[in-house]
């Protein structure tokens, strides 16, 4: 995700400041950079977020602010800040003529300019007149006061904060920040207005319909009557979390985002800071039957991003339109005529779908594993939510085939039992962005910052590609994949687990030149093999024979192609074991696999050999997946022969640990 | 030996089309990425469109997307940069570049379009 | 303006060495890999360096390429007076989706 991502409209300006005297003019050679949304029908040009770089202070930033007024005015321009960020970015937010950007760029701390633009409601219809009887009762959910002691903020439409399903449950703060509603002849209806909040506030917490019923809510006005918001209304919104935290800090801290807009580099950045912040953020993945990563908050990495499906598990088609899917969406769940409190009346219900009520039903979720485990940190909560989700249940054929890979098969679900998870070892899988065409182009794919890089992966749909390695950047191990000619592209695969307490280092070993291939172990005492890579600067792997065996009683080797450098993850943590499997199939076939036993985690997904006629590995849960070319096009027999390789670990630390406290 | 070579650039009025043409000889051309890149008079280099060696891949510059659309026939070993709604900031050598950024990066030796009333 | 900033000119003497920057930010340099060209007066660009520090056959070790986080250098020993050209830093940029090169330096060998 990243700021890497979204097919996103990015002016690139390189200005120096050589006009006005500036004194405190950027340092030669910085740029500041200019972003609007792709999506031309959302822009909002005339107003504009000005993002100061990270250490301005918030004088700065009021005085950065009155240096573009007073330059502008010199310029007869007439400009109005309309509010100044501090608390989780630096920054403000000023109306002004598009032809002052040139000028703005130029301030002294200027880091990005972001022109505002629109948010909408993610749900479908806006008003469905299918009123259910009221107090509807789902029988078969009741959980005891789920929930207690977790806040959830609604970031949505004002709502009917007197509605039985959660009166007394919700608190409507006094922050409203939203666009005047299109059309001339539009008449506000209270009704209306409050019907995609109340309906989401109830599905979270609501008496008879929500998921978290203990849960307690503050809502936010940041959409209009009509659904319509501001990635700037938004911005101001999350900053007035933060400070309401800041202020006067509660227990664990959910935020609800029912809301999408075009890819938003200043939407995202303040999630990314809320998130680090200790406040959980679950968004809907929109429903505009594309990518998620071409939206935000949805392509933020820090956020809990949630398509939806229906009944029977299938993802949810909204008319033309439908769930968004793609390596930005984190899990899948119920979005389909879900029923929830109507703003019709004060005992009526009504059902609404879409990705905002898929959204909704796991902030309920979280809410009810954060009141239960008060200390989780995101990343465990995230993994937490993958891991007692259901899997392989959504029919992948409803995505496009190349984002099916990509796309999450998990639909959410709570854990059987809110304590007795700590054992597990937790990991997930993190695709990169796709490289692009050109050989210059890598993939890179990150953890969470608490998250440990464990294994390393590549694919590319064509086979064109030079492997992948880890390494580190910024104090950290990234997965990289390498491009080869011919334009295809590539995707770097990361395993991101949860292991507290690691130490964990690559060992290289360089192209062995020679018949026996390249081999490299973790050689560190109580260091053990938790993934393999392969890398390889030639354009081709050509075939390798013989094949590579991995040697008996060597279980920490990483064995590859004799033109290829290995990289072995070691890593030392309390009570960490780990096993290699190999499934190697002798006949050409498209797809080989390989899985994990029950109590055991897949960390490593590898190929052997690392042949050009392997499009890759990736892990799928808990099972390693190799991918070759279509068995009409691949070779030889002995060619195609090619052997998938897992590595499996588990923790017998975190067992201990979580019978202790039982 | 790797050759290429552009042709259909000329004189065009703005609003007006183009299409430009890369024959490529001396190398199995489908196996590589091709892309077109120009440069205005007196100026620097500026990307303007990749396509991938099977065609199924395509990206664009921002300053023409919506306007120009490269395409290959790898049975005629030709590229293709179809350009409509010509502007005067157009104007420029329109190189023909195979697998820019690689070892196996080469070049033709350009086709000026011009765009003006 | 150009998403990768080089300087507009350098200049040396015959027989010295000169380095050319190229600095840019994450999502290009800091992640992709630096491509060198020359454009001689006239000409068409030529591949002086790949993958930030790979020569291909036929480029003398005259011309070196290194990079460190999100700048990249070109440097040349021994300078020449055909040495005098254009060149350009090129790379991926994955904000952008886009080849992005700096706006070239202009070599002037005294």
């Known amino acids: 995700q990243e700021d890497e991502d979204g097919d996103y409209e990015e002016l690139v300006l390189a200005l120096r400041s050589e006009e006005d005297g500036l004194a405190e003019a950027p340092e030669h050679g910085t740029t500041a950079t200019f972003h609007r949304c792709a999506k031309d029908p959302w822009r909002l040009p005339g107003t504009y977020v000005v993002v100061l770089k990270e250490e301005t202070h918030l004088s700065q930033s009021e005085r950065t602010a009155r240096r573009l007024q007073a330059q502008a005015a010199r310029r007869g321009y007439l400009t109005k800040i309309l509010h100044v960020f501090h608390g989780l970015l630096p920054g403000f937010l000023v109306k002004m003529s598009g032809d002052l950007l040139e000028l703005a760029l130029k301030l002294p701390h200027v880091d990005y300019i972001e022109e505002d633009s629109s948010v909408f409601a993610q749900s479908i219809p806006w008003n469905l007149e299918r009123i259910t009887p009221p107090r509807y009762r789902a029988d078969e959910y009741q959980p005891p006061d789920g929930g207690s002691l977790v806040e959830v903020y609604l970031l949505d439409t004002s709502i009917q904060s007197d509605h039985r399903e959660i009166e007394g449950r919700v608190m409507v703060t006094d922050f409203e920040n939203v666009p005047e509603e299109d059309g001339t002849r539009f008449h506000r209806q209270a009704s209306k207005c409050d019907s995609h909040g109340t309906h989401l506030a109830g599905v979270v917490s609501g008496r008879d319909a929500g998921v978290a019923k203990g849960a307690s809510m503050r809502s936010l006005r940041v959409l209009n009557c009509q659904g319509k918001g501001t990635v700037s209304g938004t911005l101001i919104g999350l900053e007035f979390i933060r400070k309401s935290q800041l202020v006067q800090p509660v227990g664990p801290l959910v935020v609800l985002l029912p809301l999408a807009g075009g890819y938003s580099r200043v939407l995202n950045a303040a999630c990314q800071r809320l998130a680090r912040a200790g406040v959980v953020l679950v968004t809907a993945a929109g429903n505009f039957r594309d990518d998620a990563c071409l939206y935000s908050p949805a392509s933020a990495p820090e956020v809990i991003t949630v398509g939806a499906t229906n009944a029977q598990d299938q993802p949810v088609t909204l008319g033309t339109l439908g769930t968004n899917f793609g390596r930005c969406v984190d899990l899948f769940a119920p979005g389909e005529d879900i029923i929830g409190a109507s703003s019709d009346c004060s005992t009526c219900f009504v059902s609404q779908s879409g990705t905002s009520q898929a959204a909704a039903h796991v902030a309920g979720i979280a809410a009810m594993m954060l009141s239960a485990e008060p200390e989780l940190t995101l990343a465990e909560l995230r993994q937490r939510l993958i891991h007692f989700s259901a899997k392989d249940v959504i029919n992948e054929a409803w995505f496009p085939e190349d984002q099916r890979v990509l796309t999450p098969n998990l639909v959410a679900a709570l854990p059987p039992s809110t304590h007795g998870a700590g054992w597990q070892l937790f990991c997930r899988t993190v695709w990169s962005a796709h490289s692009g065409p050109t050989r210059m182009a890598t993939a890179v794919a990150r953890c969470a910052p608490d998250e440990e890089l464990l294994s390393c992966s590549s694919f590319s749909r064509s086979g064109k590609r030079r492997g992948e390695r880890m390494e580190a950047q910024g104090g950290k191990l990234v997965c990289r994949a390498h491009n080869a000619f011919g334009g295809e592209g590539v995707y770097a695969i990361a395993r991101c687990c949860l292991l507290p307490q690691a130490n964990c280092s690559v060992h290289t070993a360089p192209p062995a030149e020679a018949s026996m291939g390249t081999r490299v172990h973790c050689h560190q005492q109580g260091h053990v093999l938790t993934g393999c890579s392969s890398h390889w600067e030639v354009e081709d792997l050509g075939t390798h024979k013989p094949p590579v065996l991995r040697p008996r009683g060597q279980p920490n080797q990483c064995v590859g192609h004799r033109e290829a450098s290995i990289h072995a993850s070691c890593c030392h943590a309390p009570g960490l074991e780990c096993k290699v499997k190999e499934h190697g199939i002798p006949a050409p076939q498209e797809q080989v696999t390989v899985a994990c036993e029950e109590g055991w985690t897949l960390t490593g997904c590898s190929a052997l050999p690392g042949t050009s006629h392997v499009l890759g590995a990736y892990a799928v849960d808990n099972t390693c997946v190799v991918r070759s070319r279509d068995v009409s096009t691949t070779g030889s027999t002995s060619e195609g022969a090619v052997t998938a390789v897992a590595i499996c670990c588990r923790s017998r630390h975190l067992a201990q640990a979580s019978q202790e406290l039982q | 030996e790797v050759q290429l070579l552009e042709s259909g650039g000329g004189l065009v009025q703005p609003g007006g089309s183009l299409r430009l043409s890369c024959a490529a000889s001396?190398?199995?051309?489908?196996?590589?990425?091709m892309s077109w890149v120009r440069q205005a008079p007196g100026k620097g280099l500026e990307w303007v469109s990749t396509?991938?060696?099977?065609?199924?891949?395509?990206y664009y510059a921002d300053s023409v997307k919506g306007r120009f659309t490269i395409s290959r026939d790898n049975s005629k070993n030709t590229l293709y940069l179809q350009m409509n709604s010509l502007r005067a900031e157009d104007t420029a050598v329109y190189y023909c570049a195979k697998e820019v950024g690689s070892p196996f990066d080469y070049w033709g030796q350009g086709t000026l379009v011009t765009v003006s009333s | 303006q150009s998403v990768l900033t080089q300087p507009p000119s350098v200049s040396a003497a015959p027989g010295q060495k000169v380095t050319i920057s190229c600095s840019g930010s994450n999502s290009n340099i800091g992640n992709n890999y630096v491509s060198w060209y020359q454009q001689l007066p006239g000409t068409a660009p030529k591949l002086l360096i790949y993958d930030n520090n790979k020569r291909p056959s036929g480029i003398p070790d005259r011309f070196s390429g290194s990079n460190s986080g999100t700048s990249a250098t070109l440097g040349i020993t021994g300078l020449q007076t055909g040495d005098e050209a254009d060149y350009y830093c090129?790379?991926?940029?994955?904000?952008?989706?886009?080849?992005?090169f700096g706006g070239g330096t202009k070599l002037t060998v005294l």
């Open positions: 001396g190398f199995t051309f489908s196996s590589y990425a």
């Open positions: 090129g790379t991926w940029d994955s904000s952008l989706s886009a080849v992005v």
């Open positions: 396509i991938s060696g099977s065609g199924g891949r395509t």
